[in-house]
């Protein structure tokens, strides 16, 4: 049974041309992490892999860096950057974990974080 | 190259304990987790748990808790199998086997020990 | 508990000869089975993982198919070396062997 959880920073929104960090903490289980994978939608953006470091996707080379930690952080913004991402942790024996989290990139300077929530 | 070269063969008495290492060498030790396998003799390979390399906490399976202990020690990049009150049934080959793969789909144990033979007997 | 068995126990065969073994699972594993080769007195070798794909450096003519609860092991053509006996594993959740099949010289 797969007893861990996913944190995730949620619901977020940012200004265009800002930045922003996406950040994943699973917790509640001893299994062992091997790769974490971001993804856009269906679009691979970055691997945390164990023993090789970070990878970012070479067309996100210039507006994604690696970390803090397992998170991923976002610059140079624009208005696509809105939408799902996710975090998928790779983990034995329990297998995969995936967190959710909702970016808003918008226009005017009322960008607000929204609140942390679970995803069991 | 990537190997696990295990401790020699252990002659004991019941009631005794051993303790069986494991050390690896060719790769990052704390980025695969590590696993012990029996093989009684002219039985099938049985899985008795894993220990997460990071950190330190180890999993037993059913029928492996209490007598058995997993550890490490990450300096050297070796892991144990320690076993007490050892009895006759404790007789068989013990394998530590590394979990290769990075991705789910391709976890499998590629690496493993050449195998510790223990035998209990009086 | 996920248990695998595996069919037959013992296979006789010759050299040459086309040997298929198969492991079920007691429940669906997707495609997350590996299939190790034993000789006496050595080690398990890992021979197939993710039900198909060849561990690098294992012959060719070692296959494997499957998902979900029923999985092969296929050798097209067998060799001196290959007369072993092979266990079924898979790795999620809870570990676990299938009861291996030994395979002899006719």
């Known amino acids: 049974m797969m007893t861990g959880t996913i944190e995730t920073t949620g619901n977020i929104s940012a200004e265009k041309g800002g930045s922003i960090i996406l950040q994943c903490h699973l917790s509640s289980t001893t299994a062992q992490v091997t790769q974490v994978n971001w993804e856009q939608q269906d679009q691979l953006l970055a691997i945390c892999n164990a023993d090789l470091g970070w990878h970012i996707s070479p067309s996100f080379k210039d507006r994604v860096a690696p970390g803090p930690g397992l998170g991923l952080t976002l610059q140079s913004l624009t208005v696509n950057d809105t939408g799902e991402y996710f975090c998928i942790y790779h983990t034995y024996p329990d297998g995969t974990y995936t967190g959710r989290i909702f970016l808003e990139v918008l226009e005017s300077s009322v960008a607000e974080h929204g609140a942390r929530f679970q995803i069991p | 190259q990537v190997q696990l070269v295990q401790s020699g063969s252990e002659l004991k008495k019941p009631g005794a304990s051993v303790k069986v290492s494991c050390k690896a060498s060719?790769?990052?030790?704390?980025?695969?987790?590590m696993n012990w396998v029996r093989q009684a003799p002219g039985q099938g390979l049985e899985w008795m748990g894993w220990?997460?390399?990071?950190?330190?906490?180890?999993t037993y399976a059913q029928g492996f808790t209490g007598r058995f202990v997993f550890s490490l020690d990450t300096s050297v990049s070796t892991a144990y199998l320690q076993i007490s009150s050892l009895k006759a049934e404790d007789t068989a080959v013990y394998y530590c086997?590394?979990?290769?793969?990075?991705?789910?789909?391709?976890?499998?144990?590629?690496?493993w020990g050449q195998g510790t033979t223990v035998t209990v007997s009086s | 508990d996920i248990r695998l068995t595996q069919s037959p126990s013992f296979l006789s065969a010759s050299v040459g000869d086309r040997v298929t073994i198969t492991c079920r699972a007691s429940?669906?594993?997707?495609?997350?089975l590996a299939w190790y080769q034993q000789k006496p007195g050595k080690a398990p070798k890992l021979l197939i993982y993710?039900?198909?794909t060849l561990q690098s450096g294992v012959p060719s003519r070692f296959s494997g198919s499957g998902s979900g609860t029923e999985f092969t092991l296929t050798i097209s053509s067998l060799q001196p070396e290959d007369f072993a006996t092979y266990y079924c594993?898979?790795?999620?959740?809870?570990?676990?062997f299938g009861g291996g099949t030994k395979v002899e010289i006719k």
């Open positions: 086997a590394r979990v290769g793969g990075f991705t789910v789909p391709e976890y499998a144990f590629d690496i």
């Open positions: 060719g790769y990052t030790f704390t980025s695969y987790p």
């Open positions: 220990i997460n390399t990071n950190t330190g906490n180890p």
């Open positions: 429940q669906g594993i997707s495609s997350y």
């Open positions: 993710a039900a198909s």
């Open positions: 594993g898979q790795v999620m959740r809870y570990p676990a």
